[in-house]
């Protein structure tokens, strides 16, 4: 039987069950390498609290439809009368990297994952030549996730004094040209995450190969290597790699760009301080507030929630959103669909999109950026759910009693975009980190 | 105050049964995973079973197939149904409740001998 998602198949991949301290390690293609979990497993669960192994999914009873894999295993569970087997779930959504398999809940007899990654897609518009894993788990089992940086077009420009040569990189997937073909990075080769331009010419000095690495509990590190065998002529004999480390700073601040701090022989060390290598309950919340001891911050944007079935309108040129943002609260427009964001078509108003759902909801502030995000809307013809981005400002005269009001600026493959300037927006900063 | 107590535990004969009680207090008992040890005389603590908050469990090879953990959230108790009983298995028996937000608590624990 074929590997159902091949692109996932080179890596084991974690996850993890905050609430009970367990750590899961997936392959899906082949087996884990964790002799306590036998030589089959493909899902195996470390218990920390107990320092055992169980393996709760093998990689001989797997079925895979397109969107759905399933690990059985022969070891029976306790469901009274019956004779169930312990298994795991993982559902495949569209994404647009890699992502991670996030656990989602475990019953007596199933343990239940969620990933959205490019290799759930119907169409290949997302998918990178090369991506690896972009996120860690630190000691403490906190989660350290950089996907948010990866560009799916064009590069970042590292921060370097020379002035004959710039460096542009990726996070964990090569340089995407063909999308965002800017002047500099066109003639960067295919499959390079970190391009030297020097006038008109570009080299490739790195490809991704491994995923990303935690080497103490602030300081993550991504290395580049070029692959194939011909060495460029201005690295004296030497194969150029190029180690990105991220550096999660000690307290909060704005976002910085990546620095160059070392260049020898074409081995490029970069250093990035960027709060996206913290880990994500310091960035993150589920609710409209980030506030407490975790995140050294008071943000709550719980006051713009609408009630009495009004919503925001913003206009998009073809068609209208209508948003309600931090609430439970139906768009009337929008037939049930439990959306936060609510496209309507200005031509055909029965034509009707959730853009991004109520429940599916993350408030992120990291490098100085306040967003809220909403995925899990209506598909696109992709396979990839719709999702809206609001950008939040500061703006303590805003109007509409300070709650001021969303204006959307674009769509970028089902990824709707939306700037909101209002005085809730408006962050208080504590000290001790 | 938070505490965990034991009950349940005694004499019984190769082969036979007891139920274990751990009634907790002073937690939200439904977001705690809770895990049964148990220690031999002379020997190390061991692991005997664990049942997360979610509802999954696990159990020592040991005790595969002739122990059962259990929970009635409405009675803030945990048990463990010990059946096919050995002599190996006489041990002081604890409980454990363990979430994100507490420190692990554990009981005084509760004796079992199994002995004809």
């Known amino acids: 039987q074929a590997a159902p998602f091949p692109e996932l198949c080179s890596y084991t991949w974690e996850a993890v069950d905050t609430k009970n301290n367990v750590l899961y390690k997936i392959n899906i293609c082949g087996s884990v390498d964790i002799v306590q979990c036998g030589p089959s497993s493909a899902v195996c669960m470390h218990d920390l609290k107990t320092r055992t192994y169980h393996s709760v999914g093998d990689s001989v009873l797997r079925s895979a439809t397109r969107s759905l894999l399933e690990f059985n295993t022969t070891v029976s569970c306790d469901q009274q009368g019956t004779n169930h087997r312990v298994q795991s779930s993982i559902a495949f959504l569209c994404g647009k990297t890699l992502g991670t398999p996030e656990f989602v809940t475990a019953t007596e007899c199933v343990h239940y994952f969620e990933w959205r990654t490019t290799a759930a897609c119907k169409k290949d518009i997302f998918k990178a030549n090369k991506e690896v894993p972009c996120y860690v788990f630190d000691e403490e089992l906190r989660k350290h996730d950089l996907n948010p940086l990866i560009k799916l077009s064009g590069a970042y420009l590292v921060d370097d004094s020379d002035p004959d040569t710039s460096l542009f990189i990726n996070v964990c997937r090569d340089i995407d040209t063909l999308r965002d073909p800017g002047s500099q990075l066109r003639a960067c080769p295919p499959g390079t995450a970190a391009c030297l331009v020097r006038g008109h010419q570009a080299f490739d000095v790195g490809q991704p190969r491994d995923g990303l690495k935690v080497v103490r509990k602030d300081r993550l590190v991504l290395s580049y290597v070029r692959e194939e065998a011909g060495k460029l002529d201005f690295c004296d004999g030497h194969s150029p790699a190029v180690t990105i480390t991220f550096v999660c700073p000690s307290e909060r601040r704005e976002g910085t760009i990546p620095k160059l701090t070392a260049k020898s022989n074409c081995r490029y060390e970069i250093e990035w301080i960027t709060e996206y290598a913290c880990h994500r309950d310091y960035l993150e919340s589920k609710t409209c507030s980030l506030s407490g001891e975790q995140q050294d911050v008071s943000i709550d944007l719980t006051p713009l929630a609408q009630s009495g079935g009004s919503s925001y309108i913003s206009d998009g040129k073809e068609y209208l959103f209508y948003l309600n943002v931090c609430g439970e609260t139906e768009i009337q427009f929008c037939n049930k669909k439990q959306a936060a964001v609510c496209q309507v078509k200005k031509s055909d108003t029965s034509q009707v999109k959730a853009a991004g759902r109520y429940h599916n909801q993350t408030l992120r502030y990291s490098d100085g950026d306040l967003t809220l995000i909403y995925f899990g809307g209506d598909e696109c013809s992709s396979g990839f759910q719709r999702m809206s981005v609001i950008n939040f400002e500061c703006n303590k005269t805003a109007g509409n009693d300070g709650k001021g009001t969303p204006v959307f600026t674009g769509e970028v493959d089902c990824t709707y975009e939306f700037t909101w300037d209002t005085e809730y927006a408006c962050v208080h900063h504590h000290h001790h980190h | 105050d938070v505490q965990l107590v034991e009950s349940g535990g005694g004499l019984v004969q190769p082969g036979g049964s007891l139920r274990l009680s751990c009634a907790a207090s002073?937690?939200?008992?439904?977001?705690?995973?809770m895990d049964w040890y148990r220690q031999a005389p002379g020997k190390q603590r061991e692991w005997v079973a664990t049942?997360?908050?979610?509802?999954?469990?696990t159990y020592a090879d040991s005790v595969k197939g002739r122990f059962t953990i259990s929970r009635d959230n409405a009675k803030n108790t945990v048990y463990l149904q010990m059946n096919s009983l050995r002599p190996e298995d006489t041990a002081v028996y604890y409980c454990?409740?363990?979430?994100?937000?507490?420190?692990?608590?554990w009981g005084q624990g509760t004796l079992v001998t199994v002995s004809s």
């Open positions: 454990k409740a363990s979430s994100p937000v507490l420190n692990d608590i």
């Open positions: 049942l997360a908050s979610y509802g999954w469990k």
């Open positions: 002073g937690i939200i008992f439904s977001d705690n995973r």
